[in-house]
């Protein structure tokens, strides 16, 4: 039950995270005009990964796409790439994790297959989250660097440096959305990996032991110390360790050739 809950929660958290990464990638407010300690202008500038916008005091907003690929800074291209990779990995991870969910039965899929799929999706979510966090952090670093540049060469647009009126940019809402979404995707991925451990059947589990003492055969089930039913002073309490978590299906245990003492 705990495994199912962990897996389900991991899926939901990752789903929210990936939705957030997509939202952040599409948002226009990656950087917004810094209004503190700046000449107060009647226009408000903000920029995204794909276009820059200007909102006039009347509320009129005009956005222009970056219609050049070669003219854009390499850092911006890198951020775009990281976010897209994050989205793609996250989307594939979601698709894989849907089939891996314990609560969903697809044909005669074994638990080992589900465990592998859960692990795969978990890793994908972790990488997806890291990509998003990295992308947002690179952009944030770019903003901080440009913010402290000399006023003569103040950062005034994604297209490069323009010697014009000083317009400084600070962190936009998309950065915070991206950081939170990346974090959620990462957490969801970790939860999926944890759930995978609970789904995986162990090959080398010691499931049962036949113990011979005073002519009585006592079968010990895994699960800690058991009171002996044998007679005589040589009867001992033994703890048999189960190498991994058991699924509810494993009711019957079979001894292996190593289980006899």
């Amino acid at each position: 039950m705990a495994v199912t809950a962990c897996q389900g929660l991991g899926f939901v958290v990752s789903l929210i995270g990936i939705a957030g990464i997509i939202a952040a990638t599409c948002m226009d407010q990656w950087s917004t005009q810094d209004l503190y300690n700046n000449p107060v202008t009647a226009v408000f500038n903000y920029q995204g990964l794909w276009r820059s916008c200007v909102r006039e005091s009347s509320g009129f907003t005009e956005c222009r796409g970056y219609f050049t690929l070669l003219g854009l800074p390499a850092m911006l291209q890198a951020v775009r790439a990281l976010m897209i990779v994050g989205i793609v990995l996250g989307a594939i991870g979601l698709l894989v994790s849907i089939f891996a969910l314990k609560c969903i039965r697809i044909g005669s899929m074994e638990d080992s297959a589900k465990a592998n799929m859960t692990l795969t999706s978990g890793i994908m979510f972790i990488v997806s989250g890291l990509c998003a966090i990295a992308g947002v952090s690179v952009f944030a670093n770019m903003l901080v660097t440009n913010f402290w540049m000399s006023t003569a060469n103040m950062y005034t647009g994604m297209g490069g440096m323009v010697q014009t009126v000083q317009t400084r940019y600070t962190f936009g809402a998309a950065l915070f959305v991206g950081w939170v979404a990346g974090g959620l995707t990462l957490i969801g991925g970790v939860m999926m990996c944890i759930a995978c451990r609970g789904l995986a059947p162990e090959e080398t589990n010691y499931k049962a032991v036949s113990y011979h003492a005073s002519g009585h055969s006592v079968a010990y089930k895994p699960g800690g110390f058991k009171a002996s039913t044998g007679f005589g002073s040589n009867t001992k309490n033994k703890k048999i360790y189960d190498g991994g978590a058991r699924t509810e299906d494993e009711v019957q245990s079979y001894p292996s050739k190593h289980d006899y003492v």
Partner: antibody, heavy 120, light 113 residues
């Protein structure tokens, strides 16, 4: 059609206050900024401030801060400009104007003007 | 505050001739985000309120005759009347529509020669 109708001429003594009204019609009152601009006799135009009737947000020219107050009454679609501690140099024609949408922060409609004379 | 300097103070032009009014701002009015100049031109006839002619330095307000045109970028701007008509006699003002407080030029009085 859009109209801005201002109140009549005023004669005030130095140190007094004056309140000029600007009644608007023909558009959604709460969606546009209203500016106040004055023009002293034979002089140029001087921006005093603006108000957004939808929220009551105001921006003032620092030159007038503390002396000018802009208010809006949404029930009558009217904006008021009150100027206190009047001096002789406040003698001017006071205009209200509407900031156009998508017109580069420009004022596309103007009231007819209200003459305020400050004299002892 | 941004200082707007207009030249000349007054201008006399013959009917049908070209009239040119200049405006210079103490700081650039170009917004890098949309590459637009936040400079406005107004026309004021005696006893009337100002009338919007041109915004964004070069965009004509609807209803304004096409003989009026605006140009320039950054700090230097020009209003041109290609063929002066009798009804164009007025005072013309340029306005900084970018920085608070909004500021106006001193005005240029246009007359017929």
């Amino acid at each position: 059609q859009v109209q801005l109708v201002q109140s009549g001429a005023e004669v005030k003594k130095p140190g007094a206050s004056v309140k000029v009204s600007c009644k608007t019609s023909g558009y959604i009152f709460t969606n546009y900024w209203i500016h106040w601009v004055r023009q002293a006799p034979g002089q140029g135009l001087e921006w005093m401030g603006r108000i957004y009737p939808g929220t009551g947000n105001t921006y003032y020219n620092e030159k007038f801060t503390g002396r000018v107050t802009l208010t809006a009454d949404t029930s009558t679609s009217t904006v008021y400009m009150e100027l206190s501690s009047l001096r002789s140099e406040d003698t001017a024609v006071y205009y209200c104007s509407r900031e156009g949408y998508g017109k580069g922060n420009s004022m596309d409609y103007w009231g007819q003007g209200t003459t305020v004379t400050v004299s002892s | 505050d941004i200082v707007m300097t207009q030249s000349p103070d007054s201008l006399a032009v013959s009917l049908g001739e070209r009239a040119t009014i200049n405006c210079k701002s103490s700081q650039s009015l170009l917004n890098a985000g949309n590459q637009k100049n936040y400079l406005t031109w107004y026309q004021q006839k005696p006893g009337q309120p100002p009338k919007l002619l041109i915004y964004w330095a070069s965009t004509r307000e609807s209803g304004v005759p096409d003989r009026f045109s605006g140009s320039g970028s950054g700090t230097d701007f020009t209003l041109t009347i290609s063929s002066l008509q009798a009804e164009d006699v007025a005072v013309y003002y340029c306005q900084n529509a970018y920085y608070y407080p909004y500021t106006f030029g001193g005005g240029t009085k246009l007359e017929i020669k």
